[in-house]
């Protein structure tokens, strides 16, 4: 006769491991008992369980409640056992020793491999700001056994670097994603993808990129300077900019306070019916946590009674 087993049994952490040991005997041969032991190199054998033809299953105290026979029906030549709720410490070499009549004793070894699926974590890097050089956008760490694979899935252009730390029974892999921040990256997903043999499917963690920036400011409303004449109603100036975080707007008049009746509504400056006192230099001040910009315009309200033409200067400053 001969023993049938597996060279390697692989289970995921927390699952039950079937340790196979089947005696393929000749007609009339009987199995008296099957002794299971853990036999890691450099350590003495540690008894796991004994499967006795008369007495049934005896589990050693160290494995009490964790070793069982597979569910019926059972073949009397089958000495397989179930190791319940496999933990990382169970990984190692196991031996089944089968006592048969009349053929004598047989033994076989197998290796139990316990896969520890990773629980990845993604950590965003420092705040991204337009104008920075190559900057850490995020790092992704996953620890498992064996070492997991960590990659990135994104439309954003960048570079990756990985490092690995080996522990006694596992390995931690950290991958970093670096990029040169630009406003076009705002709202783009950056996804860490972790692959591992203990996972049914890849684990994905997505981070949405936020890049701080503030665009140049400009003022609209003076494109047709002939419209800025005394008595005109509904005249307004609009300050144009964009940024992340969204900017706030503030209007001032460089050559004095804002005339009475002029309304400030965020990025818009609304005028009452125009008079010559509305002529002047107006400044739009745009700011967010990242930066601030100014744009100034000169308003010259025309008097139709006068022949002199209106002149408008647009000056933008940052």
């Amino acid at each position: 006769g001969e023993l049938e087993t597996s060279d390697v049994v692989t289970v995921v952490l927390g699952q039950d491991a079937k340790l196979p040991c089947f005696y393929r005997g000749d007609s009339g041969e009987q199995v008296g008992q099957v002794a299971w032991a853990r036999v890691d190199a450099g350590e003495g054998a540690q008894e796991l369980a004994l499967l006795h033809s008369k007495y049934g299953l005896h589990v050693s105290p160290a494995y009490e409640g964790r070793v069982e026979q597979p569910p019926p029906p059972r073949n009397p030549l089958d000495g397989s056992v179930l190791l319940r709720n496999a933990v990382q410490a169970d990984e190692g070499e196991y031996e089944c020793r089968v006592s048969t009549f009349p053929a004598g004793s047989f033994q076989a070894r197998l290796r139990l491999r316990v896969l520890v699926p990773p629980l990845p974590s993604l950590n965003p890097g420092p705040a991204l700001e337009e104008g920075q050089g190559l900057t850490l956008a995020a790092s992704c760490t996953a620890e498992g056994s064996p070492a997991p694979s960590v990659t990135w899935d994104t439309e954003v252009k960048g570079t990756t670097s990985s490092r690995s730390f080996k522990h006694s029974r596992s390995a931690a892999v950290t991958s970093e994603f670096h990029l040169v921040p630009s406003r076009s990256m705002n709202g783009q997903p950056l996804t860490c993808v972790v692959s591992h043999p203990g996972l049914l499917q890849d684990q994905r963690i997505t981070h949405i990129l936020h890049v701080s920036f503030l665009a140049e400011a400009s003022v609209r409303g003076l494109e047709d300077q002939n419209l800025w004449h005394i008595g005109r109603e509904g005249a307004m100036l609009k300050c144009l900019s964009e940024g992340q975080p969204p900017p706030s707007y503030n209007w001032t008049r460089l050559d004095g306070p804002l005339p009475s009746g002029v309304r400030v509504d965020g990025d818009t400056l609304g005028f009452p019916p125009l008079t010559t006192e509305h002529s002047g230099i107006y400044v739009c001040h745009v700011s967010n946590e990242f930066s601030s910009r100014d744009s100034q315009v000169t308003v010259d309200v025309l008097d139709p009674q006068e022949d002199s033409g209106k002149q408008v200067d647009l000056v933008s400053a940052s």
Epitope: H52, G56, H58
Partner: antibody, heavy 122, light 107 residues
Amino acid sequence: EVQLVESGGGLVQPGGSLRLSCAASGYIFTNYAMSWVRQAPGKGLEWVSRISQSGGTNDYADSVKGRFTISRDNSKNTLYLQMNSLRAEDTAVYYCARQTEDRSYGYDLDYWGQGTLVTVSS
Amino acid sequence: DIQMTQSPSSLSASVGDRVTITCRASQGISSYLAWYQQKPGKAPKLLIYAASSLQSGVPSRFSGSGSGTDFTLTISSLQPEDFATYYCQQHYTTPPTFGQGTKVEIK
């Protein structure tokens, strides 16, 4: 025919010592582990100690640990129980018994001696 | 330690009766259970080992059953020489422990 004969029992004062012997015959003594089991007057059975075939492994009940020592002389086919620091509650008939199979845990006992009475009293 | 609980602690029966004694273990012991018979002034005698295997020389009217935690000793037809005290014993773990005994008396 398997025979186990105990001796060495008697009356002893609390704190005293006794050595029990069990002479085995009718089988290959070195093939079997052995045990001592006791029975207080009118009470049930209580396992005391066990020794492996070679004498290299032994176990004790918590109630006697540190006071009793089991040993065997395979050349004389004899089992011993050295009892020190005896207490009134050790009063019992002491039986030696043969273990059916040698395993590091558990056993059933297929042959027993007739017993020897140990009385601990002042 | 594993506790072994026998019931009943005593029973009265007549010759020819079918007698059943039960033994319950405080935790699973597979089939690591033996039954012994003891008569007054005598040493115990092994009747059943491995829960259900009859020891050589023991009459077939004795039988054992059970596995795990619940076990039974049955005497199919009580004979005069069967009046005695019966003990169950687990040997799954050290220390091996005995039940408190069941005394079978003549009715």
